[in-house]
Structure formats: C-alpha cells, structure tokens
C-alpha cells in the first residue's frame, strides 16, 4: 500500500515512514500490514486466500503376483518398468474409479517378492472448510477398495484371469500426508503483534482474515460516525467532532451538542 507525497514536506516525510515503511523518493512503501501516508495505519483485512485445491498422499504397498520380478524392473527408465507402470496405473485407475478425489498413482519402488510395489495414491479436493473430512473419507474408501481388489484378484492354479493379481496379505498403508492449510494460524501469523485481534470469518466458504475494523462481518465494530483504528491494545473508535456535536463513548454513540455545552447543559441522544 502506498501514499504519494508532493511538495516541500516530502523530505520530512521520508524520515518519518513508520512500521518498517521505506521511502522510494515519492512516498512511503508500506509493509503488508500497514498503510497511510506514513504507514501509520494498520490494515483491517489480510489476504490469506486459500489454495484452490488441497492434496493428500497415501503411501501404500501391494504385492503383484501375476508378474515375476526381473532386474529390469529396478531401472525406472527401462521399457519393462514403463510397461509395468502403465499396466499398474490402468489397474489402479479401475480400482479407484468411484473416488472423485482420486488423481492417480506414483510408483516409488519395485522390489522382489513377486513384485512388491511401493507407491503413492494421490488425492485432491477443492478447498472448502470441510476439506479434512473430505480427504479423510477418501482415504478410507481407498483402503476399502485396495483391500477388496487384493482379496478378490488372486492367482488360481498359478494363473491370473485379471489384469493383475495380488497377494492378499501384502497390502499395507504406510503413511497418509495431507497438505496442511490452517487459515486461523495463517491469519494469526500474518497479523503479527495484532494477532490476538484478527479473526477468520467465512463468506461463500472463503476465509477472510479481518480485524473488527473491517466492516460487514459479524465481529465488525460499529464506530457510528467515528473511525475504527487498530492499536496494540486492540480496536478503538476515534470519534469525530462536527460543527454542531462532539461524539464520545466506546463506539462514538454519545453525541453532545456544542451549543448546550457552552450553555452548561449536557444532552445525550
């Protein structure tokens, strides 16, 4: 946020940039949290726009019994590895076809034991406040589906009649990692020393990091005719004086008519 300065007073302004603001020859360049001619004002809203999508990664191991391990499978650039990868991916795409969050699989390692396939199942969902629940549910369905297929698609008399067959006991889920997105934490961090006064409110499922000085939210402070200003002790209303009235009170809701004061009478409305 920047405010341009013209005229002789500019040099004075340069040395007076506050809150880490820097003078660029014309104006104070303010850090994210501040604005105003001297960077003296604290913003009332901080952009913590969430990512469009949130990802999860499940580390799984399955044992494929319908393929015999050969040395070429250790080399990820070999034709054999590429073929195995293609067939395994096609098989897993079928297994997980009913899961909207499923993105694909990524083989990390093939090793001996028929073929032990260490791989990641990749999941992704649009960001909503419920993303954790959505991804938790998806990981449970992945577990169910891989358990089912590795129980059903098995070798009979050393022959597999499916695209791939598995060892029922060779299926393991090692680890589940969900991309962490915590708007409350981000909001607190970005608000720095004002973190106690900034909160996250949702509108159309989008999080907004706001202080009570931001109008239009449930936590918004109504300063009536005054101006809301953030300080280290919290939001405060700076009350105005008009030609006819002085305003006071925590929310500038007490108006005192000047003529009555000069006449030594107080009148509140």
């Amino acid at each position: 946020r920047t405010t341009t300065c013209f005229g002789d007073g500019c040099q004075n302004t340069a040395s007076r940039c506050k809150n880490g603001g820097t003078w660029d020859g014309l104006k104070c360049q303010c850090p994210n949290l501040y604005y105003g001619e001297l960077c003296e004002e604290v913003v009332s809203s901080i952009d913590i726009g969430p990512p469009e999508t949130i990802s999860a990664q499940m580390e799984l191991t399955v044992t494929v019994t319908s393929v015999k391990f050969t040395e070429e499978l250790k080399n990820h650039s070999s034709q054999e590895f590429q073929e195995f990868k293609q067939t395994f991916t096609e098989q897993m795409n079928i297994v997980y076809s009913g899961i909207p969050e499923y993105v694909g699989v990524n083989i990390t390692k093939l090793r001996l034991g028929s073929v032990v396939v260490e791989h990641d199942v990749l999941l992704r969902t649009k960001y909503t406040p419920e993303y954790k629940t959505v991804l938790d549910n998806a990981t449970e369905v992945v577990k169910e589906k891989i358990t089912k297929v590795t129980t059903q698609q098995i070798m009979i008399n050393d022959i597999c009649s499916d695209m791939m067959c598995f060892n029922t006991t060779g299926t393991q889920v090692q680890n589940i990692t969900v991309t962490q997105y915590d708007p409350e934490e981000d909001c607190r961090k970005m608000a720095k020393e004002y973190g106690d006064y900034f909160v996250v409110e949702y509108r159309d499922q989008k999080p907004y990091c706001i202080s009570p000085c931001e109008p239009g939210f449930s936590v918004s402070k109504n300063c009536n005719l005054g101006k809301c200003q953030m300080s280290l002790s919290g939001p405060q209303c700076l009350c105005v004086t008009t030609e006819t009235h002085w305003y006071s009170g925590e929310t500038c809701n007490q108006g005192t008519q000047k003529s009555l004061v000069y006449g030594h009478h107080h009148h509140h409305h």
């Epitope: 015999k68 070429e72 499978l73 070798m155 050393d158």
Partner: nanobody, 123 residues
C-alpha cells in the same frame, strides 16, 4: 517401436491342422511373455496359449492337448500349432506381447498386439 505380424491363417476342414506364425520386432523378444488370443464373431477376446521367456506354457482348457505354443528366440518368432481343429475354433487369432514375465491370461495385461489372422474351420 514394437511390431507383431501374424500369418498362417486360412480355411481348414474340421479335424485338420494349421500353423500360425508371429514375427516380432522392436523389443528384446527373448525376455517377454508371448501369447495367442482369439476372437470369434460376436464374442469376447479370449486367451488361447501363453509362453514365458523361460519356456513355461499355459493353455485355455478348450485347446489343451490340441494346440501347442512355441517360440524361436533366434528368429524373433512365435508359433501356434493347431491340430484336431473344430468349428468352434473359428476366429481371428491375435499375437500379443508383453515385455514382462506375466502369468495372466487377461488381454488387458498385454500392451502389444498384431492385426490378427483369420482361421475358419468349416467343411
């Protein structure tokens, strides 16, 4: 680029014999799994015979004792000797290949296919 070209199909009387050949190129022939599949009109493609790099073979129940699969690694060729042919053997016969050592009779596991050769068994 992997290429498979079948030959040897034709019209034969019930009880007769045919020998199908498949010429392979574009990969290390001796390492993979080779197979013969067939598809009769209006039916699904089915596995007929399979041979691994170590010579291990397997056959569909319907052809056991009548068909023999073999390979000549020096010539990059696969063969299917078909004896005692029956009317129900009438189909397009396909040669299929995988670079992997497979133990599956499912067509989806084989990425490389020839164009097919027609075998008609009729009197």
């Amino acid at each position: 680029e992997v290429q498979l070209v079948e030959s040897g199909g034709g019209l034969v009387q019930p009880g007769g014999s045919l020998r199908l050949s498949c010429a392979a190129s574009g990969f290390t022939f001796s390492r993979g799994t080779m197979a013969w599949f067939r598809q009769a009109p209006g039916k699904e493609r089915e596995g007929v015979a399979f041979i691994n790099s170590d010579g291990r073979t397997s056959y569909a129940e319907s052809v056991k004792g009548r068909f023999t699969i073999s390979r000549d690694n020096a010539k990059n060729s696969l063969y299917l000797q078909m004896n005692s042919l029956r009317a129900e053997d009438t189909a397009v016969y396909y040669c299929a290949a995988s670079l992997l050592y497979l133990m599956t009779v499912n067509a989806a596991a084989y990425p490389y296919w020839g164009q097919g050769t027609m075998v008609t068994v009729s009197s």
